[in-house]
């Protein structure tokens, strides 16, 4: 088992996350652009990515990471091959998924949106020219990055890039393509050993991790199947929470239990976690509610609000569970404990 | 109490296909990582492949790339493993694995009994 540290990740703020939520959207909505407004799109989205570099964390391995990305999809830009472009396609999505989860400042979230979105459309475009454009905006960026701080370590990483793109000019596509596998290979490591602050598939926000359920039980088994994995159905603590988690909610159209009820005592709504229910927080409630019709002791999210509801329907749910802050132990290639009495024979 | 059961093996030729299933209990499978591990004939376990919770994160070891695909079927507690193009040194047992909740690597706490998967013409 993995030691976990209680959350040390400092609270990000509204604002960031709403940008965040934005570029999201931004990423779904691309794919239905024609080919003329996805290339216009790229070059504004090049335009934002250029000023959002110099407001880069400090932190140099995620930087290095940013860094061959860029590297790797410049030189992804130049292959022939549509079925090996494919695949490195997917292995860098998964790992634009994972890089998604670490607990750095928005402003990096934003970063690697861009990209992942950026590459995608890149991949979809059918003339060479074009490629070749892009590929050089890309450089100019990339000349950008050596500009950042920490400057050893930085311009150390920015030369060592600069010969390996060099290198990478001067191969052939055969070779080409070993490189690139090679750099993803050293990639996915580099991600395995950041510290991830949510599980796998959970959405990081403010310090804690959430699960959104893509299946549905009732309020009861939900606080269970939370509770198993060491969280919470959600308890919400703030505004700024709320939104978020309204936004999740009303996003994909769902009816999604929250840790509210009114079940010890009729009319008195009461946390999971033993809070009650702050007079700030009942504005909340869609108009009408909670009215209670038919024994509906239980809180969701439906719509732009809240609502009550009875509490054996069976609905989607939310986990909460604090971001852990993880010292990492050196791993094994399996740490596994049999479900069987014995393990397999090694 | 954590239980996988496989199914699904078999003899194939080379260059077959197979479908292993792993139907879990005793945990909320819908909220776990889930994976394959497997043993060839008198040597070590082999991390095969993961999916995430949702299904939509996915990972490979190199050896399989390309021709194993897992799934899950949050609604029946079921993982899967397509195996396509299959050959002789994909011989193995094949362990149905329940992931570690925060690792992003290939670590599993608990796994099955295994099922059998022989190639060979």
């Known amino acids: 088992q993995v030691s976990k540290v209680p959350s040390s990740i400092s609270q990000e703020q509204s604002r960031q996350d709403a940008i965040y939520q934005n570029l999201t959207q931004l990423k779904a909505a691309v794919g239905e652009l024609s080919e003329k407004s996805k290339l216009q799109e790229i070059y504004q989205e090049l335009t934002q990515l250029k000023a959002a570099v110099g407001e880069l964390p400090e932190k140099s391995k995620l930087q290095e990471i940013y860094q061959e990305l860029t590297r790797l999809k410049a030189a992804v830009g130049e292959l022939p091959e549509k079925s090996k472009l494919q695949e490195i396609y997917q292995e860098l999505t998964w790992l634009k998924a994972a890089v998604g989860e670490l607990p750095e400042k928005s402003k990096m979230q934003e970063i690697y949106q861009e990209l992942t979105r950026l590459k995608a459309a890149v991949g979809e475009l059918p003339e060479k020219s074009k490629q070749q454009e892009i590929y050089q905006e890309l450089t100019r960026l990339k000349a950008a990055v050596g500009e950042l701080p920490e400057k050893s370590k930085q311009q150390e990483i920015y030369q060592e890039l600069t010969r390996l793109k060099a290198a990478v000019g001067e191969l052939p596509e055969k070779s080409k393509q070993q490189e690139i596998y090679q750099e993803l290979t050293q990639l996915k490591a580099a991600v395995e050993r950041l510290c991830h602050p949510c599980p796998w598939e959970w959405t990081f926000f403010q310090g804690n991790c959430y699960f959104m359920s893509n299946s549905q039980r009732n309020w009861h088994d939900s606080i269970t199947a939370c509770k198993e994995v060491g969280a919470q159905l959600v308890v919400i603590k703030s505004a700024e929470e709320q939104n978020f988690l309204q936004l999740q909610s009303s996003r994909s159209n769902r009816f999604t239990w929250m840790g509210l009820s009114d079940l010890n005592q009729e009319g008195t709504w009461q946390w999971v976690d033993g809070s009650p229910l702050l007079p700030s927080f009942k504005q909340y409630w869609n108009r009408g509610e909670p009215n209670n019709v038919g024994e509906e002791d239980c809180a969701e999210f439906s719509g732009n609000g809240w609502n009550d509801d009875k509490c054996n329907l069976a609905k989607f749910w939310i986990c909460k569970k604090s971001a852990a802050s993880c010292s990492r132990d050196e791993e094994q290639f399996l740490s596994p404990a049999p479900a069987t009495p014995n393990p397999p024979p090694a | 109490e954590v239980q996988l059961l496989e199914s699904g093996g078999g003899l194939v030729q080379p260059g077959g296909s197979l479908r292993l299933s792993c139907a879990a209990s005793?945990?909320?499978?819908?909220?776990?990582?889930m994976g394959w591990v497997r043993q060839a004939p008198g040597k070590g376990l082999e991390w095969v492949s993961k999916i995430g919770p949702h299904g939509r994160l996915t990972y490979y070891a190199d050896s399989v790339k390309g021709r194993f695909t897992i799934s899950r079927d949050n609604s029946k507690n079921t993982l899967y493993l397509q195996m396509n193009s299959l050959r002789a040194e994909d011989t193995a047992v094949y362990y149905c694995a329940k992931g570690n909740l925060w690792e992003m690597s290939r670590r599993f706490d608990y796994w099955g009994q295994g099922t059998l998967v022989t190639v060979s013409s």
């Open positions: 005793g945990f909320t499978f819908v909220m776990y990582p």
